[in-house]
Amino acid sequence: LVPHLGDREKRDSVCPQGKYIHPQNNSICCTKCHKGTYLYNDCPGPGQDTDCRECESGSFTASENHLRHCLSCSKCRKEMGQVEISSCTVDRDTVCGCRKNQYRHYWSENLFQCFNCSLCLNGTVHLSCQEKQNTVCTCHAGFFLRENECVSCSNCKKSLECTKLCLPQIENVKGTEDSGTT
């Protein structure tokens, strides 16, 4: 089976790398525009220059192209705790990230939120906090992990997952109560 190619890919594959086929005349290959520029006018004929113009402020192209418009620069989303790591330039989009001691959680492919790295109070750091992953904590005896925090087994209800981890403590508490009645 022949893989399906989009119209643009089909047109581009007829010309050598770095060139694209003229939309009105498929016998002409025009040179693509450099990153940081966009296509203003197609080349008038073979061996003639493509009319490329620099992207305006607030827009960019990150690779060679024959786009009719530059792409809009991304904005860092303050409500998600994002901060700007580097500003948008004509040939590179804005880079957004998180503050120190925070990590990114991706809700979707193109949306992340910044959260504070867990400190592992009442536990130890098993894996340090990374750019896209929270600290992995191991809890001390008498504590269990809930929402990546070490919580005292005294807060463990029978219906929760913690019963397995806290079982010795729960039995201990019962034992102490029983011994107190004699």
Partner: nanobody, 119 residues
Framework: EVQLWESGGGLVQPGGSLRLSCAAS????????MVWVRQAPGKGLEWVSH????????FYADSVKGRFTISRDNSKNTLYLQMNSLRAEDTAVYYC????????????WGQGTLVTVSS
């Protein structure tokens, strides 16, 4: 106590429209970023859209961009989702939620409203 109550779901034909509402109480609605998420049958939660407190620069998932519009009325403590050009793949239970603060889990969300897109 935080309460979120979605309404407006129903059965609609492909290409049709629906407007979902979410009535909020128990917190200062005007200070919070609000979120719409959805869960299609047998699938995980999908982030659909969110809107900051001032209503400016909302976010849309690529799958709904240009078709859905999120809005809010802070005087009525109500969040909306206008859904146009509906497709079969938009069939899901839609939930409104508060943007999480402590960690990557949703603490507060409503009971959901079912949207079915079918001919």
């Amino acid at each position: 106590e935080v309460q979120l109550w979605e309404s407006g779901g129903g059965l609609v034909q492909p290409g049709g429209s629906l407007r979902l509402s979410c009535a909020a109480s128990g917190f200062t609605f005007a200070h919070e970023t609000m979120v719409w998420v959805r869960q299609a049958p047998g699938k995980g939660l999908e982030w659909v859209s969110h809107i900051p407190p001032d209503g400016q620069d909302p976010f849309y998932a690529d799958s709904v961009k240009g078709r859905f519009t999120i809005s809010r009325d802070n005087s009525k403590n109500t969040l909306y989702l206008q859904m146009n050009s509906l497709r079969a793949e938009d069939t899901a239970v839609y939930y409104c939620a508060l943007l999480p603060k402590r960690g990557p889990w949703i603490d507060y969300w409503g009971q959901g409203t079912l949207v079915t897109v079918s001919s």
